[in-house]
């Protein structure tokens, strides 16, 4: 299977995930990674050319730098 298994969501069920089990979607790099590798935003050095970190309420355009949001752990459903 390409994706983690899905089921109808009950009130307490986890959200569907694009990742296989043991992987989580990393909002910084925008793809699934091993859950232990989730990244968190770091302070940028002065003069860095990448955009300032975004929040969910302030999306910005980017040409390549990481998105800057905190990683959201959504492991594949077991």
């Amino acid at each position: 299977m390409r994706r983690g298994p899905r089921s109808l969501r009950g009130r307490d069920a986890p959200a569907p995930t694009p990742c296989v089990p043991a992987e989580c979607f990393d909002l910084l790099v925008r793809h699934c990674v091993a859950c232990g590798l989730l990244r968190t935003p770091r302070p940028k050095p002065a003069g860095a050319s990448s955009p300032a970190p975004r929040t969910a309420l302030q999306p910005q355009e980017s040409v390549g730098a990481g998105a800057g949001e905190a990683a959201l752990p959504l492991p594949g459903l077991l």
Epitope: R3, T17, P18, R30, H31, C32, P59, S62, V63
Partner: antibody
Framework: QVTLKESGPGILQPSQTLSLTCSFS??????????VGWIRQPSGKGLEWLAH???????YYNPALKSRLTISKDTSNHQVFLNIANVDTADTATYYC??????????WGQGTTLTVSS | DIQMTQSPSSLSASLGERVSLTCRAS??????LNWLQQKPDGTIKRLIY???TLDSGVPKRFSGSRSGSDYSLTISSLQSEDFADYYC?????????FGGGTKLEIK
């Protein structure tokens, strides 16, 4: 079933703006971690990545083309748009959109061909 | 940008033959690589994601592997429908970048 279909003008003159539409079905761009991207391929050449838009409206562009590119979406109508300003003959290519979910693009459209000619 | 160097650029092989294509990443991409197949009509299909995971519906004669910064796509026994163009794509960082492609032709 996930499907994507690109549409565009077919032919443009230099300096005009290219407007492409990706119409999709089988998924929603309101879903967490869902995205749509664009690539292109000049005839007989390789693939070039252009732009990407995500469910949360975060956008990424190819740095070499960023000043000319604008990507946007209409979530309710299941469409993503790519505009390329000031086209030249070098923009003659087949343009593809694709769905991204978890591990980059997993489904691609059939492509739409653009010819830029004076 | 991460450069993906793909080899060979073209390859002639016979039905039933085993072939391997390689992409080398200029920077660490940690296995975040897909292999794509493009048929002569332009149709693009993902075969492998995360360097080695086969997409659903893709024949098991296709496999992906990694050795350091080198990523390989192997077709264990070529079938007529496998003659096409193949591309690697890194998704470790933006901008996404493709290998230059391999044209697989019938000998």
């Amino acid at each position: 079933q996930v499907t994507l279909k690109e549409s565009g003008p077919g032919i443009l003159q230099p300096s005009q703006t290219l407007s492409l539409t990706c119409s999709f079905s089988g998924f929603s761009l309101s879903t967490f971690a869902m995205g749509v991207g664009w690539i292109r391929q000049p005839s007989g050449k390789g693939l070039e990545w252009l732009a990407h838009i995500w469910w949360d409206d975060v956008k990424y562009y190819n740095p070499a083309l960023k000043s000319r590119l604008t990507i946007s979406k209409d979530t309710s109508n299941h469409q993503v748009f790519l505009n390329i300003a000031n086209v030249d003959t070098a923009d003659t290519a087949t343009y593809y959109c694709g769905r991204t979910y978890g591990y980059d693009v997993d489904y691609w459209g059939q492509g739409t061909t653009l010819t830029v000619s004076s | 940008d991460i450069q993906m160097t793909q080899s060979p650029s073209s390859l002639s092989a016979s039905l039933g033959e085993r072939v391997s294509l390689t992409c080398r990443a200029s920077q660490e991409i940690s296995g975040y690589l897909n292999w794509l197949q493009q048929k002569p009509d332009g149709t693009i299909k993902r075969l492998i994601y995360a360097a080695s995971t086969l997409d659903s519906g893709v024949p098991k004669r296709f496999s992906g592997s990694r050795s350091g910064s080198d990523y390989s796509l192997t077709i264990s026994s070529l079938q007529s429908e496998d003659f096409a163009d193949y591309y690697c794509l890194q998704y470790a960082s933006y901008p996404r970048t493709f290998g230059g492609g391999t044209k697989l032709e019938i000998k």
